[in-house]
């Protein structure tokens, strides 16, 4: 499979926290009552790791059927395995649910590689380690799939958290989060803390690993340090944002900022890599190569194909540069930057060399569909999807992997002019609505 492609991504199993929690640097007052504070029941409710996706436990139907569901901010369907499949431990059995309602409508979702198809219906859904509510939600019962479910993974479905505009078969199919907000008092906001391991996990370690937190309806102070900085959601389809500048070790890539957002830039928990438009990718890799030139690596490494290994504990993090993305701020002519470390963009891979090795794949890749800020970016930060205020917030994650010399950062403000010009306007044609 391609690296950094869209779902499905393999997931790990479950257990105790990865990485230590850092103390809060600031303790600002809540902006709105009930929107911030402690959400103890939701902390550590995700499992998995960056190369394999992150999943949450959900229940579907009456009596409740428990399933592990991949959290995906890059799609908008709630879809679950609903027929036997060699790679599934369990699946949704509609005939056993007294509350299932058939919508008598099919759905077909093709990916670049693979696809799933199924039958639409509704049923009662809840999240055991989430808000104490049950909602009636649309469910795509997957009856056939190809290269979607993954052997040895521990998830049976996907929770698309983006907007109705990109739901299949069309935008009339209300996404799960919209249903949740409409039917309950849960605020129209969720936040994600994805915790990358920073080191390869063997099967026994994965069983005892934690993936992070999905806080539904709020923001948990314990999950981040410093301040939250917000960037506007440009358009409510994907979680689209605008990147206004890119730096490698503080050196500006000096490209027309439209290139960074060609044809869009999105925040997507269902993609492994930081994916960049072709021109941007080439410029970024050239700059990263130059910064790390004391060591040379084969082309296959920079293509995300070959692994590079070092003797355990000797990975030369210091030779790899930090990468900063400047995002449009909430105030006119103001931006802020998020900075990731090689500990985020070099993805640990297990089971390829000996236990005396630490092996990594380069987790920045080329895209033909714009910038995708996948797990590689999100693992550095606590990310707030503030749908109510049409904005996305970033703060340094309390669980991000770093070393004694450098840490991920969210910093601002910076003066940046003409940021609106950085957005790319996708041509609208009559045919575009017909494309899958």
């Amino acid at each position: 499979t391609q690296h950094g492609i869209r779902l499905p991504l393999r997931s790990g199993l479950g257990g105790a926290p990865l990485g230590l929690r850092l103390p809060r640097e600031t303790d600002e007052e809540p902006e709105e009552p009930g929107r911030r504070g402690s959400f103890v029941e939701m902390v550590d409710n995700l499992r998995g790791k960056s190369g394999q996706g992150y999943y949450v436990e959900m229940t579907v139907g009456s009596p409740p059927q428990t399933l592990n569901i991949l959290v995906d901010t890059g799609s908008s369907n709630f879809a679950v395995g609903a027929a036997p499949h060699p790679f599934l431990h369990r699946y949704y059995q509609r005939q056993l649910s007294s509350t299932y309602r058939d919508l008598r409508k099919g759905v077909y979702v093709p990916y670049t590689q693979g696809k799933w198809e199924g039958e639409l219906g509704t049923d009662l859904v809840s999240i055991p380690h989430g808000p104490n509510v049950t909602v009636r939600a649309n469910i795509a019962a997957i009856t056939e799939s190809d290269k979607f479910f993954i052997n040895g993974s521990n998830w049976e479905g996907i929770l698309g958290l983006a907007y109705a505009e990109i739901a299949r078969p069309d935008d009339s199919l209300e996404p799960f989060f919209d249903s949740l907000v409409k039917q309950t008092h849960v605020p129209n906001l969720f936040s994600l803390q994805l915790c990358g391991a920073g080191f390869p996990l063997n099967q026994s370690e994965v069983l005892a690993s934690v993936g992070g937190s999905m806080i539904i309806g709020g923001i948990d102070h314990s999950l981040y340090t410093g301040s939250l900085w917000y960037t506007p959601i440009r358009r409510e389809w994907y979680y689209e944002v605008i990147i206004v500048r890119v730096e490698i070790n503080g050196q500006d890539l000096k490209m027309d900022c439209k290139e960074y957002n060609y044809d869009k830039s999105i925040v997507d928990s269902g993609t492994t890599n930081l994916r960049l438009p072709k021109k941007v990718f080439e410029a970024a890799v050239k700059s990263i190569k130059a910064a790390s030139s004391t060591e040379k690596f084969p082309d296959g490494f920079w293509l995300g194909e070959q692994l590079v290994c070092w003797q355990a504990g000797t990975t030369p993090w210091n030779i790899f540069p930090v990468i900063s993305l400047y995002l449009m701020g909430e105030v006119t002519n103001q931006s802020f930057r998020i900075t990731i470390l090689p500990q985020q963009y070099l993805r640990p891979v297990e089971d390829v060399a000996t236990s005396q090795d630490d092996c990594y794949k380069f987790a920045i890749s080329q895209s033909s569909t714009g910038t995708v800020m996948g797990a590689v970016i999100m693992e550095g930060f606590y990310v707030v999807f503030d749908r109510a205020r049409k904005r996305i917030g970033f703060a340094v994650s309390a669980c991000h992997v770093h070393d004694e010399f450098r840490t991920a950062a969210v910093e601002g403000p910076f003066v940046t002019l003409d940021m609106e010009d950085c957005g790319y306007n996708i041509p609208q044609t009559d045919e575009s609505t017909l494309m899958t």
Partner: antibody, heavy 120, light 108 residues
Framework: QLQLQESGPGLVKPSETLSLTCTVS??????????WGWIRQPPGKGLEWIGN???????YYNPSLKGRVTISVDTSKNQFSLKLSSVTAADTAVYYC????????????WGRGTLVTVSS | EIVLTQSPATLSLSPGERATLSCRAS??????LAWFQQKPGQAPRLLIY???NRATGIPARFSGSGSGTDFTLTISSLEPEDFAVYYC??????????FGGGTKVEIK
């Protein structure tokens, strides 16, 4: 054309340090296009990778050699060297130096090899 | 650890015959695989890289194929100088470290 030639003692006593040098002729060891490496082959057996070095001094070693190996480079002499400490009879082998080309991936040029016997 | 298994261990053939050598990886190595030829008393020589590309100066009778876990080196018509030991090596995990155990092609 570029050639590689190994040199060093053919006999080393157990527990001592094996030292070999590879001289590069017909080209520069400071080329940014190559790593340089050592591979060994015990008599009648297969090939075992020992380690690589870049002209900048960046090194990679086989973890199975458990810290006994050191590879260094001397760009002024167009040479790179191998030191293997605490040798035993199991380290008896033909030692080859080689160039890692084709985008740092493949050993595309080899020295003739030198037999090193570990014996008292 | 990725293990490369070569088969058969020995292949007994006559000049002019076709030789088919196999190299199987314990997990996918994509197309990052090389084949080497080694004659007695000589250093190995690179024949094929990236699974199917002939190295400089290698005759067209040598060809490589495969990707993922299964690879084949084919010598279309054996010449007397082709009787040697052949090794495969993966470089999916870098730096290149793992060699197969070798296949000896001997005169029948």
């Amino acid at each position: 054309q570029l050639q590689l030639q190994e040199s060093g003692p053919g006999l080393v006593k157990p527990s001592e340090t094996l030292s070999l040098t590879c001289t590069v002729s017909g080209g520069s060891i400071s080329s940014s296009s190559y790593y340089w490496g050592w591979i060994r082959q015990p008599p009648g057996k297969g090939l075992e990778w020992i380690g690589n070095i870049y002209y900048s001094g960046s090194t990679y070693y086989n973890p199975s050699l458990k810290g006994r190996v050191t590879i260094s480079v001397d760009t002024s002499k167009n040479q790179f060297s191998l030191k293997l400490s605490s040798v035993t009879a199991a380290d008896t082998a033909v030692y080859y130096c080689a160039r890692l080309g084709h985008g740092y991936n493949y050993f595309d040029l080899w020295g003739r090899g030198t037999l090193v016997t570990v014996s008292s | 650890e990725i293990v490369l298994t070569q088969s058969p261990a020995t292949l007994s053939l006559s000049p002019g015959e076709r030789a088919t050598l196999s190299c199987r990886a314990s997990q996918s190595v994509s197309s990052y695989l090389a084949w080497f030829q080694q004659k007695p008393g000589q250093a190995p020589r690179l024949l094929i890289y990236d699974a199917s590309n002939r190295a400089t100066g290698i005759p067209a009778r040598f060809s490589g194929s495969g990707s993922g876990t299964d690879f084949t080196l084919t010598i279309s018509s054996l010449e007397p100088e082709d009787f040697a030991v052949y090794y495969c090596q993966q470089v999916y995990v870098w730096p290149p470290r793992t060699f197969g155990g070798g296949t000896k092609v001997e005169i029948k």
